[in-house]
């Protein structure tokens, strides 16, 4: 079998066997290596010298194998923005970032730049899980059957109506999507004021 | 070269708060982490949050939230950790470091004694 | 929270042995692993960063490997003033956490 080509190697069509790992020079017409990720192009290539690679500099990185004659400069997430980290930056990685707690991303650029605050969600409903947490708005859905929720909240669950006999009490009132059922000892008769609440 | 220089030891009682500072040169204070970590008495290290001084934004171990405050004076230089609510298990020594693919540059740490 | 196991707790050893120590993490931290030597009464001392990149000033002796969850801190030679308590620390995402540490003590 024919030996591979190291780089710099004579390219014709001005493309490269490793689309990945080198690059078309075409100043010479030739195939160099690129940098690896945490590095950056400190000296060109020519046709008798490969490209020579230096590590980033503290506080810059480059993510992918590059060409690139400098690094790019860690930025912070923008808290202003409604951002949090979650890893740091490093010479191989941007800062990663996500919404807080309670937001949802409002725009997005290749990644999140901006989140706003979640929507609450009325009384008798909850937010849908959703697959990613801070992907998208609430989407309120009504509580199954035997379950209720009594705020408007951005997170709060739609909770099982309480069951009274469990407790060795009847049931008073029936709850509803919006209110707990009401509960009343056995005994005692309802009194008229009572809506809502639960007597032991 | 770069220099973080922490304040001097504590001993304080339960349930009051104590104040770390710790003073960087060498370098832009501006555009680097500050991290926060502790180690009490013959155990490991324990990473208690950072501040990014350039836009003085703190995040925090979750365990320490609303218990720790961390902040930063862009004029002098200087972080600071305020951990408050103090019971004897906070009995530790505090370092400041600075980050960059892990700890490179720590401060020589301050030890802060809780008891009654 | 990741957890950064580390092993042996402590070990014996005499000049001149070879010593290995290990830290597994409990999730894939990539290679955002650095290592740590500490003596009584003084901060931490960086070894090592990205799992295997050995900081300027620390001794050859001292080389660091792997990626995913398994790391080692190998030291070739053990030389006097080489005891001391190693620990590992992963830095992929908050919060960072530490290994708990190993002694290394003289024989």
């Known amino acids: 079998s024919q030996p591979q080509a190291v780089p710099p190697y004579a390219s014709e069509n001005q493309t490269c066997r490793d689309q990945e790992k080198e690059y078309y020079e075409p100043q010479h017409r030739i195939c160099c290596s690129r940098c690896p990720p945490g590095t950056y192009v400190s000296a060109k290539c020519s046709r008798i010298r490969d490209t020579v690679c230096a590590t980033c500099a503290e506080n810059s990185y480059n993510e992918h194998w590059n060409y690139l004659t400098i690094c790019q400069l860690c930025r912070p997430c923008d808290p202003v923005m409604g951002l949090e980290e979650i890893a740091p930056c490093t010479s191989k990685r941007k800062t990663q970032c996500r919404c807080q707690p309670g937001m949802f991303c409002a725009a997005w650029a290749l990644e999140c730049t901006h989140c706003e605050l979640l929507s609450d969600c009325p009384p008798g409903t909850e937010a849908e899980l959703k697959d990613e947490v801070g992907k998208g708005n609430n989407h309120c859905v009504p509580c199954k059957a035997g379950h209720f929720q009594n705020t408007s909240s951005p997170s709060a669950r739609c909770q099982p109506h309480t069951r009274c006999e469990n407790q060795g009490l009847v049931e008073a009132a029936p709850g509803t999507a919006q209110s707990d059922t009401t509960c009343k000892n056995p005994l005692e008769p309802l009194p008229p004021e009572m809506s809502g609440t639960m007597l032991m | 070269q770069v220099q973080l220089v922490q304040s001097g030891a504590e001993v304080k009682k339960p349930g009051s708060s104590v104040k770390v500072s710790c003073k960087a040169s060498g370098y832009t204070f501006t555009t680097y982490y500050l991290h926060w970590v502790r180690q009490a008495p013959g155990q490991g290290l324990e990473w208690m949050g950072w501040i990014y001084p350039g836009n003085v934004h703190a995040q925090y171990n979750e365990k320490f939230k609303g218990r720790v405050t961390i902040t930063a004076d862009k004029s002098t230089s200087t972080a600071y950790m305020e951990l408050s609510s103090l019971r004897s298990e906070d009995t530790a020594v505090y370092y400041c470091a600075r980050s960059w693919e892990g700890f490179p540059y720590w401060g020589q740490g301050t030890t802060v004694t809780v008891s009654s | 929270d990741i957890q950064m196991t580390q092993s042996p707790s402590s070990l014996s050893a005499s000049v001149g042995d070879r010593v290995t120590i290990t830290c597994k993490a409990s999730?894939?931290?990539?290679?955002?692993v650095a290592w740590y030597q500490q003596k009584p009464g003084k901060a931490p001392k960086s070894l090592i960063s990205?799992?295997?990149y050995r900081y300027s000033g620390v001794p050859s002796r001292f080389s660091g490997s792997g990626s995913g969850t398994d790391f080692t801190l190998t030291i070739s030679s053990l030389q006097p003033e080489d005891f001391a308590t190693y620990f590992c620390?992963?830095?992929?995402?908050?919060?960072?956490?530490f290994g708990q540490g190993t002694k290394v003590e003289i024989k």
């Open positions: 999730q894939n931290v990539g290679i955002n």
């Open positions: 990205s799992a295997s």
């Open positions: 620390q992963q830095y992929d995402t908050y919060p960072f956490t």
